[in-house]
Interface confidence: medium
């Protein structure tokens, strides 16, 4: 004969546990139904009646099968430096992540507690390490032969164009200016010179020249921790 199916509430066999999506109620000493995600236990079970579940109220949730008397409160609204990547529903908490241009300086179990703006590398400095969701940008001085003329959290140092005739030599914060339209590959000994790249980046207008003080090998070493303020600007 097939085993009889027990309906909640029921007394478990000695030494056995309740089934999936059931819990053992210590007061009733019975196996009782859990409430589904998005619900909570409004009335606990007795020896003769099963758990009575009710929907979570607005701004509260339960994510798991449960028998909690009250739903959990959703987290506070996302701050201005965050975006809501998961809305508060009856079944899930609100998740806030940092908006573009920011990174998570202090994370929590899900989402971010504190966002901070990504460091911007000033002209003469380029991105050595791009920002991630949880780490800031690292800037580095543009090496001889390269430049950055932007204040940006994404731009790397770019190569100077190589001129047939140089009108204005390039430096760390400005491209070379040519008097001829056809660049050549002639190079000054010891300088780092590169061609214009095949690039999808937009070209920027050039600021007033400023001398490069970057040591010639500063960008060539494997990147370790970098002084946060070097070559960077706040928002």
């Amino acid at each position: 004969l097939p085993a009889q199916v027990a309906f909640t509430p029921y007394a478990p066999e000695p030494g056995s546990t309740c089934r999936l999506r059931e819990y053992y109620d210590q007061t009733a000493q019975m196996c009782c139904s859990k409430c589904s995600p998005g619900q909570h236990a409004k009335v606990f079970c007795t020896k003769t009646s099963d758990t009575v579940c009710d929907s979570c109220e607005d701004s509260t949730y339960t994510q798991l099968w449960n028998w909690v008397p009250e739903c959990l409160s959703c987290g506070s609204r996302c701050s201005s430096d965050q975006v809501e990547t998961q809305a508060c529903t009856r079944e899930q908490n609100r998740i806030c992540t940092c908006r573009p241009g920011w990174y998570c300086a202090l994370s929590k179990q899900e989402g971010c507690r504190l966002c901070a703006p990504l460091r911007k590398c000033r002209p003469g400095f380029g991105v050595a390490r791009p920002g991630t969701e949880t780490s800031d940008v690292v800037c580095k001085p543009c090496a001889p032969g390269t430049f950055s003329n932007t204040t940006s959290s994404t731009d790397i140092c770019r190569p100077h164009q190589i001129c047939n005739v140089v009108a204005i030599p390039g430096n760390a914060s400005m491209d070379a200016v040519c008097t001829s339209t056809s660049p050549t590959r002639s190079m000054a000994p010891g300088a780092v010179h590169l061609p214009q790249p095949v690039s999808t980046r937009s070209q920027h207008t050039q600021p007033t020249p400023e001398p490069s003080t970057a040591p010639s090998t500063s960008f060539l070493l494997p990147m370790g921790p970098s002084p946060p303020a070097e070559g960077s600007t706040g928002d």
């Epitope: 050595a128 791009p130 790397i156 010891g190 780092v192 790249p197 999808t200 010639s216 060539l220």
Partner: antibody
Framework: QVQLVESGGGVVHPGKSLRLSCAAS????????MHWVRQAPGKGLEWVAL????????YFADSVKGRFTISRDNSKNTLYLQMNSLRAEDTAVYYC??????????????WGQGTLVTVSS | EIVMTQSPVTLSVSPGERATLSCRAS??????LAWYQQKPGQAPRLLIY???TRATGIPARFSGSGSGTEFTLTISSLQSEDLAVYYC?????????FGPGTKVDIK
């Protein structure tokens, strides 16, 4: 540990195309420039192409300019080299190599094992 | 482009002896020079960068020196596993260029 695994090599006729791939693992792929370097049989090393960490800046050796393109898919940790209009002199082992940082001028701290491309009629 | 030359083409050294390899640039590359080791059937491996800085995990018997146009790689006490071709590479000027290599044989 850092691993670079090239694939896509083979025998191809002159004028035809081939696409090489390099699967990267063991490091944060999307913050490093990546390069292709080749080595003809019994010969030395020749730098071929470089792509910046974000894929926006690309550089090529004169010998392949206009025929080869380099690209990357940071979501798949994969580097590509599309080789068109192949010539006999493109026959070589092609290595992908990791740049030491995002700088456009750099040396290579890790190399793949290489994939052989043979261009022959 | 900067042309890199290496000498000798082949170097035969007994185990335990010193091996000295030379690399010359056609114009100054400051100290922007790297050395690579390529064992038979293997990919190149970075040994030295910035002319004299040993890469991670490289034994102390390998050392680099020089700046400008003249560079030297020294293996102070040659081991049998050092049988390889050694390449220098400049990364000061465009395009990146390698030397033709020096093959180190065990006598």
């Amino acid at each position: 540990q850092v691993q670079l695994v090239e694939s896509g090599g083979g025998v191809v006729h002159p004028g035809k195309s081939l696409r090489l791939s390099c699967a990267a693992s063991g490091f944060t792929f999307n913050i490093y420039g990546m390069h292709w370097v080749r080595q003809a049989p019994g010969k030395g090393l020749e730098w071929v192409a470089l792509i910046s960490y974000d894929g926006n800046d690309k550089y090529f050796a004169d010998s392949v300019k206009g025929r080869f393109t380099i690209s990357r898919d940071n979501s798949k940790n994969t580097l590509y080299l599309q080789m068109n209009s192949l010539r006999a002199e493109d026959t070589a082992v092609y290595y992908c190599a990791k740049a030491v940082d995002t700088a456009v001028v750099t040396f290579f701290d890790y190399w793949g094992q290489g994939t052989l491309v043979t261009v022959s009629s | 482009e900067i042309v890199m030359t290496q000498s000798p083409v082949t170097l035969s050294v007994s185990p335990g002896e010193r091996a000295t390899l030379s690399c010359r640039a056609s114009q100054s590359v400051s100290s922007n020079l790297a050395w690579y080791q390529q064992k038979p059937g293997q990919a190149p491996r970075l040994l030295i960068y910035s002319a004299s800085t040993r890469a991670t995990g490289i034994p102390a018997r390998f050392s680099g020196s020089g700046s400008g146009t003249e560079f030297t790689l020294t293996i102070s006490s040659l081991q049998s596993e050092d049988l390889a071709v050694y390449y220098c590479q400049q990364y000061s000027n465009w395009p990146f260029t390698f030397g033709p290599g020096t093959k180190v044989d065990i006598k």
